[in-house]
């Protein structure tokens, strides 16, 4: 997250970190069910661990943390690397979470976002770009949903209805390491960090997010079919 600020503790209990060995964060994710996460499809890896209820990026033990393995990864059937359409994936955890103030699911919004809606994006991704500098703790950033026309103007021929753009002033954006993390609007999960320009936070080049309102049926049916 570029030019965000430290999230208040316990305010993002659905935020997960996807980790490679040794404790290497590569993506964020979102708890949407006691045993299921949503993340970006481009975050698919064979072997990874899931950390929930953790505030700092470092692997130091925190009393609220819960660690899991991903036992099943189900990317949306319409996703095709290296494209960005349908960029979402469900991950089944090896067991159900223990609900606490630090670990709690969030509901996926069934309403599509309108331009001007104020949202919050969070993650442990780099805070500088193109340099790489990681934060000590989870970062939060207020962003506004942009109209689809502004989104298409920013990225000609690259935007479809499975995506929406959101940003703020130049210099504020999600970035590498934030993929799969939550965009929360009006208390519901509206999007996932997906892609954007490089370097991050360039003027008139907003972040692009997976438009989850288009996928509520797929999410529900996939969880039911695999539970």
């Amino acid at each position: 997250i570029i030019n965000g600020s430290d999230c208040d503790m316990h305010t993002q209990p659905w935020q997960a970190a996807l980790l490679l060995r040794p404790n290497q964060l590569y993506c964020g994710a979102v708890l949407v069910h006691p045993q299921w996460l949503l993340t970006a499809a481009h975050c698919r890896k064979k072997v990874f661990r899931v950390r929930l209820g953790h505030y700092s990026l470092s692997p130091v033990y925190e009393s609220g943390q819960q660690m899991f393995q991903g036992v099943k990864s189900i990317p949306h059937p319409g996703y095709s690397h290296p494209g960005h359409s349908n960029d979402l994936m469900l991950i089944k955890l090896n067991r159900r979470i223990r609900p606490t103030k630090d670990v709690r699911p969030i509901n996926v919004s069934s309403h599509c976002p309108s331009a001007g809606t104020k949202c919050l994006v969070s993650g442990w991704g780099t805070t500088k770009s193109p340099q790489v500098h990681f934060p000590k703790v989870l970062q939060c950033l207020n962003i506004s949903v942009l109209s689809q026309k502004r989104c298409e103007d920013a990225y000609p021929r690259q935007i479809d209805d499975t995506m929406f753009c959101a940003g703020d002033k130049a210099g504020r954006d999600s970035c590498q390491g934030d993929s799969g993390g939550p965009v929360v609007c009006n208390g519901s999960l509206q999007g996932l960090v997906s892609w954007g320009d490089y370097p991050c936070a360039r003027p008139n080049r907003p972040g692009v997010y997976t438009n989850l309102c288009k996928f509520t049926k797929w999410i529900q049916e996939t969880i039911q079919a695999n539970s």
């Epitope: 590569y26 481009h42 390491g177 993929s179 490089y198 991050c200």
Partner: antibody
């Protein structure tokens, strides 16, 4: 078949210019960042330049900064390297290489260069 | 710039031998290291990315390990087609830099 084909190499005098081209086929060129890498006779690999998929980020090795310019034309599936003020030490085989890391995607994961051309030889000599 | 130091610069080995090549970065690069194989007159070929992930189509006798500053490429049982030069490369930080190469020769 995924393929990169370089062209434009040749013999040039010190101080001269050349423009290398790299034609891409078999993949969606506009989705990938690209690199130029060179190899002097009997030496190792040296990274020369990088360009992101949308051309929004470009970088160069210090040894070529200010003399070489990387560019791309996504509509033509082509990558270019304009080389000016050439020196004897620029003599090398020049490879274009696809970067498997998508810098547009916002995961923190880096791959490497997975597709390489056959190379084109640049000789700088009087 | 990050310096990548490979050792040894050359190694003589026989078919069936286990060969280990090391690469050291001048500063930590997490797991973001790639290994390439290059045969004379040919372009390099990506073998391993992210320090230990095998590129599609690469035989399983090749393996990589390491994190931070120290990395290893291992060929568990050398085959005739493995005689080549091997390079490591750090990929997270510009300028990208390669190691000096390790030539694997027939003993």
């Amino acid at each position: 078949e995924v393929q990169l084909v370089e062209s434009g190499g040749g013999l040039v005098q010190p101080g001269g210019s050349l423009r290398l081209s790299c034609a891409a086929s078999g993949f969606t060129f506009e989705h990938y960042s690209m690199n130029w890498v060179r190899q002097a006779p009997g030496k190792g690999l040296e990274w020369v330049s990088y360009i992101s998929s949308s051309s929004s980020y470009i970088d160069y090795a210090d040894s070529v900064k200010g003399r070489f310019t990387i560019s791309r034309d996504n509509a033509k599936n082509s990558l270019y390297l304009q080389m000016n003020s050439l020196r004897a030490e620029d003599t090398a085989v020049y490879y274009c290489a696809r970067d498997l890391t998508s810098m547009q995607s916002r995961d923190y994961y880096y791959y490497g260069m997975d597709v390489w051309g056959q190379g084109t030889t640049v000789t700088v000599s009087s | 710039d990050i310096q990548m130091t490979q050792s040894p610069s050359s190694v003589s080995a026989s078919v069936g031998d286990r060969v280990t090549i090391t690469c050291r970065a001048s500063q930590g690069i997490s797991s973001w290291l790639a290994w390439y194989q290059q045969k004379p007159g040919k372009a390099p070929k990506l073998l391993i990315y992210a320090a230990s992930s095998l590129q599609s189509g690469v035989p399983s006798r090749f393996s990589g390990s390491g994190s931070g500053t120290d990395f290893t490429l291992t060929i568990s049982s050398l085959q005739p087609e493995d005689f080549a030069t091997y390079y490591c490369q750090q990929v997270p930080i510009f300028p990208y830099t390669f190691g000096g190469g390790t030539k694997v020769e027939i003993k």
